[in-house]
Amino acid sequence: QKPPKRKTPAQPKVPACCEEVQELKAQVANLSRVLSELGRKQEKDWVSVVMQVMELESSGKRMESRLTEAESKYSEMNNQIDIMQLQAAQTLTQTSADAIYDCSSLYQKNYRISGVYRLPSNDFLGSPELEVFCDMETKGGGWTVIQRRKSGLVSFYRDWKQYKQGFGSIRGDFWLGNEHIHRLSRQPTRLRVEMEDWEGTVRYAEYSHFVLSNELNSYRLFLGNYSGNAGNDALYYHNNTAFSTKDKDNDNCLDKCAQLRKGGYWYNCCTDSNLNGVYYRLGEHDKHLDGITWYGWHGANYSLKRVEMKIRPEDFKP
């Protein structure tokens, strides 16, 4: 899975007469050129990272240290792109006093490149600075990605604190953090779940309303109507259910679902879906109940190849 190709940001419509605006335009054009070059460099480097990761899988003992090396190389490389992106975004938004609180805000300010952004802290909303991945392309864009599974390099069998704060690599596999997701869903929000199986088929599920309650309410999940092509709604069973982790059992079960399903999730008793389950590779992907499952599509024993969960405001207009 390559990282998304980066597009030139759309230019805002401004009077041509204004020198200041012309200067800004020139800055953006320049930054866009730099971005394109870095994007090309990134794709080449990504191939070498993938090769390293594949190598890692067959070298048991050296896996951890080599993985760290590969990840830090990739991170370093992407940091350059992040700086360029953020400068581009700031160039476009400096003149506006509107708060940037999610990816849809950035989209509305004409930032149209999918990738990593650092959302500024907001004292009024009580939200800290947050690094997010924005999907500016899917179905009009403006999506803040809250979860991704694609490489299997990050364990999702984590404790309450880690699920609260978030973990993983923002460009790879990650959980944004329940506290952040809760804050982002305080306004009316949509949820989109995208899935890919091991045959390369892609499906999605979308929910007209998505709320994650606060920690006091155990990050309970509330969902609106389902639409999509991922078969039967496999999140309905988890609706109005508290979040559980291996060290905090909030499920409706005599068994500890988080321990049985090896993840943190809105476990009922136990699953119709388990998007934070164990990442199983091809060959092992259809043998386990604790995988990344979506019952409505491939059943209870099929672990998916890729999953992404993303949110945006209900009233978002591309």
Epitope: Y237, C253, N268, C269, A300
Partner: antibody, heavy 125, light 107 residues
């Protein structure tokens, strides 16, 4: 043969305490969740409490929460119900039951497949 | 808490009759329903679990159906030993709850 035998019932004054025991045999006790159900004279069944096989998860009916404690000793194949601050309305026959688990499509279904004969608890002054 | 409501509360029937007892949950419980039979002075006995699965050793004249909120226990041909009280019970979420019972007696 799977068997459950309750004991420890009797007459107790309001505010008093009692500990019920349930001795299990004929199955691997530690592998199964267990439950207590009661039946007041002339009334229907009321679920009281349940405990997982390891003893790590416990659940209670609102009517007994904070007063009753379910526990188990897997080395002795015994289930317990410690009843404190007893009230007249706790008067009932108390049954212990083995909880069986079935799994369909990733969901666990629980049901009480074997029951003891019951022990009578009377709370009266 | 999920409320379970059985109907009728009692039914008079003859040997050979088909008897149907219904149980309604106050909210959806998928198929998390069990049916028990209890005779006077005896412990309850499991008949049906997961709404429609027949417990081992239970005669095939007993059957269960339903999903969500509405469930049915059917005795296709009533036998003398079937005169008893029947309870439905949900295990969808804690606290587990029983219906108030349906007494089947001789007409």
């Amino acid at each position: 043969e799977v068997q459950l035998v309750e004991s420890g019932g009797g007459l107790v004054q309001p505010g008093g305490s009692l500990r019920l025991s349930c001795a299990a045999s004929g199955f691997t006790f530690s592998s199964y969740a267990m439950s207590w159900v009661r039946q007041a004279p002339g009334k229907g069944l009321e679920w009281v409490s349940a405990i997982s096989g390891s003893g790590g998860s416990t659940y209670y009916a609102d009517s007994v929460k904070g007063r009753f404690t379910i526990s188990r000793d897997n080395s002795k194949n015994t289930l317990y119900l410690q009843m404190n601050s007893l009230r007249a309305e706790d008067t009932a026959v108390y049954y212990c039951a083995k909880v069986e688990r079935d799994m369909v499509r990733g969901h666990y279904y629980y049901y009480m497949d074997v029951w003891g004969k019951g022990t009578t608890v009377t709370v009266s002054s | 808490d999920i409320q379970m409501t059985q109907s009728p509360s009692s039914v008079s029937a003859s040997v050979g009759d088909r008897v149907t007892i219904t149980c309604r949950a106050s909210q959806g419980i998928s198929s998390w329903l069990a049916w028990y039979q209890q005779k006077p002075g005896k412990a309850p006995k499991l008949l049906i679990y997961a709404a429609s699965s027949l417990q081992s050793g239970v005669p095939s004249r007993f059957s269960g159906s339903g999903s969500g909120t509405d469930f049915t226990l059917t005795i296709s041909s009533l036998q003398p030993e079937d005169f008893a009280t029947y309870y439905c019970q949900q295990a969808n979420s804690f606290p587990w709850t029983f219906g108030q019972g349906t007494k089947v007696d001789i007409k």
